[in-house]
Structures are given as structure tokens and as C-alpha cells.
Interface confidence: medium
Amino acid sequence: MAVTACQGLGFVVSLIGIAGIIAATCMDQWSTQDLYNNPVTAVFNYQGLWRSCVRESSGFTECRGYFTLLGLPAMLQAVRALMIVGIVLGAIGLLVSIFALKCIRIGSMEDSAKANMTLTSGIMFIVSGLCAIAGVSVFANMLVTNFWMSTANMYTGMGGMVQTVQTRYTFGAALFVGWVAGGLTLIGGVMMCIACRGLAPEETNYKAVSYHASGHSVAYKPGGFKASTGFGSNTKNKKIYDGGARTEDEVQSYPSKHDYV
């Protein structure tokens, strides 16, 4: 029951997380003009991964897409890629995890298969969450270091000489949505991996019944169960994974190469 709850909760948390990652990726407010210390203007600028917008004090809002691909900063492209990879992995993970849910019966799918699928989706959620967190963090770092859109090139009246001034941009709502969503997806993935450990069918060890007849002992091995080697056998429970049985102590940890945070 606890395993089903853990799996179900992991799925729901991951679902919310991935929805958040999608929302963050689509949002326009990745960076917003800092209103705290700016000269007076009726214009408020903010930018997303796909377009930049202007909102005026009258309420009028106008957005313009980044119609160029080659002209965009490499870091912005990298953030886009990380977010899209996160969404794709998360979506596949959700699809896999639906079939892995213990509360859903699909034909005669064995628990071992569900365990595998739960583990796969869990890993996908973890990587998806890491991608989102990495993407948002890279963008936040760009803002902090004024790496992207940090200067406004204005022309003065002095024969077209270029004048550069720092534009004050601060963290937009999308960054916080992305961080939270990435964290939720990561937590959901961990919960799925934990649920996987309890999903695998346990190797039930039955003690053989000895019948004393004709002066010699015969160990009766009931069909369909693994035979015991005797009364003094190792009764430690084992989980069966695809690719061989391992004890709990032998379960491999999966090192993540997405070591951004």
C-alpha cells in the first residue's frame, strides 16, 4: 500500500513539475526590467526565451519574437535546449509511468516489468528536473553577470557615436517557476525510484516439508516455487530486476552527468 502511494505521489508530483517546466519555458518573463532603480518611463520591458515584450502603463502590451536563430546568444540557445530536453524527457517519463502505475492493470503485465518502468520513468524525471534547474540557473547566471541583453546600445546625436548604458534586468517569474518545477520533477523522480524498490516481486522462500519414508529423506519441492536448500537457508529477501537478481545492498546508484547545480 505504501509503495502504491509513493508511486502515485511521485507521479503526481512529477506531473505538476513537468507542467511547471512547460509553463516556465513558454513564459515571457524570464528577465524583467528592474523598476526599483530606473528613470521614469511608461514602458516596462521583459523577455522570455522566445520573444521580448513591452508593457506600457496604459496597459498596452506588445511582444516581438526572436525571428533569428543564428543571431541569438549561444547561452540562450543552450537554455532553450536544456528546457526542451527536460520537457521531452519528462513527457516520455510521464507516458512510461502511467503504464507503470500499480493501480492500473494493463493485460498481464508482471510486477517486475512495472518495477522496471517505474525505475525508468523515475530516472527520466530526475534528468528532466536537472535539465530544467540547469537551464534556469544558466539563464539566472547570465542575468547576474549581465551576459545577455545587459547593454542598451543607444545612438547619441554626436555623429552616430555609440553610447552604451547598463540596462537593469532582474529575475523574472519564469525563473522561480522553473526552479520550483525542476525541483518537483526531481523529487517526483526520486519517489518513483524509491517506489520501484518496493514494487519488484519478493522472492518468497518456502521451507521444504520432509517426509520420512523407507528410511531415507526426500525433500518435496512444490512446483512453481524455488526450492529451499534446507532449514538453515539464507532467508534474506531479494528483489528481482531485469538483468539478474541483486540484494538491496547491491542496488546500483546512477551517477548523473548533469552536474550543473
Epitope: P39, T41, V54, S58, F60, A152, Y155, G157, V165
Partner: antibody, heavy 119, light 107 residues
Amino acid sequence: QVQLVQSGGGLVQPGGSLRLSCAASGFTFSSYEMNWVRQAPGKGLEWVAYITGSGRTMYYADSVKGRITISRDNAKNSLYLQMNSLRAEDTAVYYCARYWNYAGGMDVWGQGTLVTVSS
Amino acid sequence: DIQMTQSPSSVSASVGDRVTITCRASQGISSWLAWYQQKPGKAPKLLIYAASSLQSGVPSRFSGSGSGTDFTLTISSLQPEDFATYYCQQANSFPLTFGGGTKVEIK
């Protein structure tokens, strides 16, 4: 060459109307907020009106509110000041100026056009 | 509305002199103050923005300082072409307002 060229000034009777124009060149006009500033003979500078790049938001000085309208045509790279119900005190040299909203200053100015309100 | 008060209204100085013009705002305007130079019959020219940043192409003898309500424009060594009228302008809130101007004349 970044510049603002003004036209439309002249002599007008009290209560009359006049439309000033300001043609921009050398920069992306629609990206900039613009202002009209005036200077009465022998007096200091007085801000008159402000308009955003889209032309959707405007601000006016109390002294001209209801009588003056600022507008722009981004397709023509032009800024306008429609002046109605003109008074003697509106006599001044009118300047159009580009507002540099990251610095809070007006970095490009037109050459000015004289509006004289007299009977 | 924010009132801008400039002083003195006029100053007589010689070439090479150090000239200081002050501008006081009726309420705090952070550092959003611009300084302009205007010569007779000409349009104003932006000298200083954000209280202390020198506009491109403006000689380094011009400098600005101050924050909040009190601001200063300093011409370290007055040149013949610097004789003009100087205006301050606040950019903290609408309506934008200018100081009354300071005329720098030849002594």
C-alpha cells in the same frame, strides 16, 4: 546620421490650431519614447508632452492638458504635436526630443520651431 | 510635481576658471538627473545623465555629482565654448521638470 527635423511652426491667432511635425532619421524610431519641450522667449525649458514607442501611452504637462495632443506615425518615422485653443502664453520655440529611457535624459533634439500666438 | 531649483541664476567667470552649478529637487529623485547645455538660438545638448555619467562626445572637464535632492555640475576649467545656459532636468517621475537655468557669462 541620427537627427530630428522639425516643421510646421508659424503665426497663429489665439484660439486657433496648429500641427507641428518632427521627422526622425538614422535610428529605429519605433523603439524610442519621444517628447516635446518648449521654450518661451527669454525663458527656460518646459516639458510639454511624452509618448511611448508604440504611441499608445501619452503624458502631458498640466498647462497644456486637454488642448494639446501628441501622436506618432512609426511607418513614416514622424512625431506630431496637435495644438488647439492656442493662447498667447503658448508662444515659444517647440523642440521634439528623443527620450533615452535607460538614462533619463533627452539625447537627440530637433532644431526647434517657433510658434507665435498673436492677434 | 517635483520642482527643480537651480542656483545661481547666472555666473560670471573667466576662461580657465572652475565653475560649479547646483540643482536642488523638491523631493528625492535618486540619481535621475540630467544636465543640458544650451547656446543662444540652438537646441539643448545632453551633457550628463544619471547625475554623474558623461554623455559620449562631451569633454571630460564637465562632471556631475549628487544623489537624492542635491546635485552639482562642475566645469573644471572653463573654455570659451562653454559660455552658455545650463539646465538640470529630473527623470524620476512625470511630469518631467527642468530647473530655471544658469547662465554662464564671460567676466
